[in-house]
Each structure stands twice: as structure tokens, then as C-alpha cells.
Interface confidence: low
């Protein structure tokens, strides 16, 4: 499942390169394990606001697509408590290409831990 | 078209426990998040929690912690709301509503009056 | 944690008027987080403008939001008879907060 997310997540990148959408995003580049969860929700709530703002039905159905996959994948591991982790708008914000990268890494984190 | 469908008013008695339920339809249920919102007769919205059905991550407000208890059952997308042990400050409007963009309640539940009396 | 504080309590005005409602932060707030919602009598709230600005779908374009910080405004700019309700100004994200509510009659 995490695989298919990643590449719904280069799909994205692909639909918004001929888009101009200057939203800034709550990107957590430095994800600790022991708060990796927290910040894959923070991730998943971000990613709707790519949807939000391109207005395009592809994207819109990516997105949609992508979160429920990763909801899938989530809910396999079982209800994880973290505790002391950042809350998402106190992450820093960064432009789409960044988030969707950060992105990227965080998936390739839980991949590389199940 | 997204519903979200919540249980009829209940009449209870102080002590006595309760499980309010809200239905979700049009939409995958997993992927939002769900929040319950109380309202006492003739006052304002009060935050009580939200849940994460996907994984049934759940964050309560601090006024409302250890008072009732959230959950939701993927299978029939349903979120709850119970008590234990109501009281009669208890009595007042609850409301169900789906965290969408950016988490903010985009669609709600007509609301379930409780009300609590000997 | 963040209180949003909403001013007046009441507002009275008549249609066609322009009606300012106000919400205030303890501190401050991300403009992507803070929501306007209308509540009428005996109806569930319904929300009006998401990220400080946003128009929720279906919304007349005579209500507008802005601000940043910990500033905020909701302005209906004619008022018409249906708009004359409670309104609420809400912090969400990770965390919510409601204001308590300005009452327009």
C-alpha cells in the first residue's frame, strides 16, 4: 500500500508541474520516528489543500485515492499513541515541491519500517 | 452527496449511561476526521473531540476529557459519543461534524438533544 | 490554550446594511485555521469561510472573511433577512476553539 502512495505522490508532482499554485505548506522535513504517525496525518490534511487550490479533477481524485490508502495502511499498524510530537501548524511552511519531497520520505520511512 | 445522520433525543435519568450515534454516507469515512460540538440550551458551541476513524486516533478537549468517550466503527461508518454516567449538566445539543479542509467542519449532523433529569 | 474572544456580543442592524463581526486570539493564529460559521434557531451551524478568507461552497459572495494573527473579521456586506442569526469564529487544525458566538439581529 505505502509503494502505491508513493506513486500517487509522483503522479502529483506530474499533474502540478504545468499548474502555478503558490500555496505554502505545513511540511515537517525532519520526521522523527517516534512521531512519524502524527506527522503523516499532518501530511494527509496538508495534501487536501493541493487539491483545494488546483481546481483539477485529476488531482482531486489522486488526493482522494492517496489518503485512502494511506488511512489503510495506517489503520494495519494498529492505534499508535505519540506523545510530545509537534501539532501540524507549527510546522514550517514550504512551497509544494518541498512538501510533496518531504512527503515522499516520510512514506519511504514507514515503508522501510513494516 | 456527503450526510452525516445522528440518533433521535433521548430522555435519560442522572447515573444512567448513553451511547449517541452519527451516520456518514457519501464519503469514504476514513478519511476525514469526525468531531462532536455541545451546545447547552441557549449557549454557544463547545468543542469536545474529534476522532481519526482510519485508525480511531482520537484527542479530546481538556474540559471534556475522562467525561465521555469517542469512537467509530469503520465497518457501518458510524462515529459515537458516550457517557458512563450523565448528569444533569449534561442535558443539551450534540453535534456531530466532519473535520474537511484543513480540518474545520465543513458538514454536520442535525444534532441529538439529551436531556437529563430525575 | 488559544481563547478567541467575539465582538459586539450583539449587533443590531437593518437589512441592506453592512454588518463587521469581530474575533480576537489570545494569541496568535494561523490564517489557514480560523473559521466563520452561522447558526440560525433550532438549525445545526453551518460553515461560511475556512483559512480566514475561503468561501465554503454555496456561499453568497456578500460574506467575506479576513484578517491574520490575531485579528479576524466576518463581513456581510448587504445584509439580507436570512443572515440575521448567531455567528461563531472558530481555531481548528490540530486543535479547536470556538469563539462564543456574536448575535446579529
Known amino acids: 500500500n505505502w509503494v502505491n502512495v508513493i506513486s500517487d505522490l509522483k503522479k502529483i508532482e506530474d499533474l502540478i508541474q504545468s499548474m502555478h499554485i503558490d500555496a505554502t505548506l505545513y511540511t515537517e522535513s525532519d520526521v522523527h520516528p517516534s512521531c512519524k504517525v502524527t506527522a503523516m496525518k499532518c501530511f494527509l490534511l496538508e495534501l487536501q489543500v493541493i487539491s483545494l487550490e488546483s481546481g483539477d479533477a485529476s488531482i482531486h481524485d489522486t488526493v482522494e485515492n492517496l489518503i485512502i490508502l494511506a488511512n489503510n495502511s495506517l489503520s494495519s499498524n494498529g492505534n499508535v499513541t505519540e506523545s510530545g510530537c509537534k501539532e501540524c501548524e507549527e510546522l514550517e511552511e514550504k512551497n509544494i515541491k518541498e512538501f510533496l519531497q518531504s512527503f515522499v520520505h516520510i512514506v519511504q520511512m514507514f515503508i522501510n519500517t513494516s | 452527496e456527503v450526510q452525516l445522520v445522528q440518533s433521535g433525543a433521548e430522555v435519560k435519568k442522572p447515573g444512567e449511561s448513553l451511547k449517541i450515534s452519527c451516520k456518514v454516507s457519501?464519503?469514504?469515512?476514513?478519511?476525514?476526521?469526525i468531531g462532536w460540538v455541545r451546545q447547552m440550551p441557549g449557549k454557544g458551541l463547545e468543542y469536545m473531540g474529534i476522532i481519526y476513524p482510519g485508525d480511531s486516533d482520537t484527542r479530546y478537549s481538556p474540559s471534556f476529557q475522562g467525561q465521555v468517550t469517542i469512537s467509530a466503527d469503520k465497518s457501518i461508518s458510524t462515529a459515537y459519543l458516550q457517557w458512563s454516567s450523565l448528569k444533569a449538566s449534561d442535558t443539551a445539543m450534540y453535534y456531530c461534524a466532519r473535520g474537511g479542509n484543513w480540518n474545520c467542519f465543513d458538514y454536520w449532523g442535525q444534532g441529538t438533544l439529551v436531556t437529563v433529569s430525575s | 490554550e488559544i481563547v478567541l474572544t467575539q465582538s459586539p456580543g450583539t449587533l443590531s442592524l437593518s437589512p441592506g446594511r453592512e454588518a463587521t463581526l469581530s474575533c480576537r486570539a489570545s494569541?496568535?493564529?494561523?490564517?489557514?485555521?480560523l473559521a466563520w460559521y452561522q447558526q440560525k434557531p433550532g438549525q445545526a451551524p453551518r460553515l461560511l469561510i475556512y483559512?480566514?478568507?475561503r468561501r465554503a461552497t454555496g456561499i453568497p459572495d456578500r460574506f467575506s472573511g479576513s484578517g491574520s494573527g490575531t485579528d479576524f473579521t466576518l463581513t456581510i456586506s448587504r445584509l439580507e433577512p436570512e443572515d440575521f442569526a448567531v455567528y461563531y469564529c472558530q481555531r481548528y487544525g490540530s486543535s479547536h476553539t470556538f469563539g462564543q458566538g456574536t448575535k446579529l439581529e
Open positions: 457519501g464519503y469514504f469515512f476514513t478519511t476525514y476526521w
Open positions: 494569541q496568535s493564529v494561523s490564517s489557514s485555521y
Open positions: 483559512g480566514a478568507s
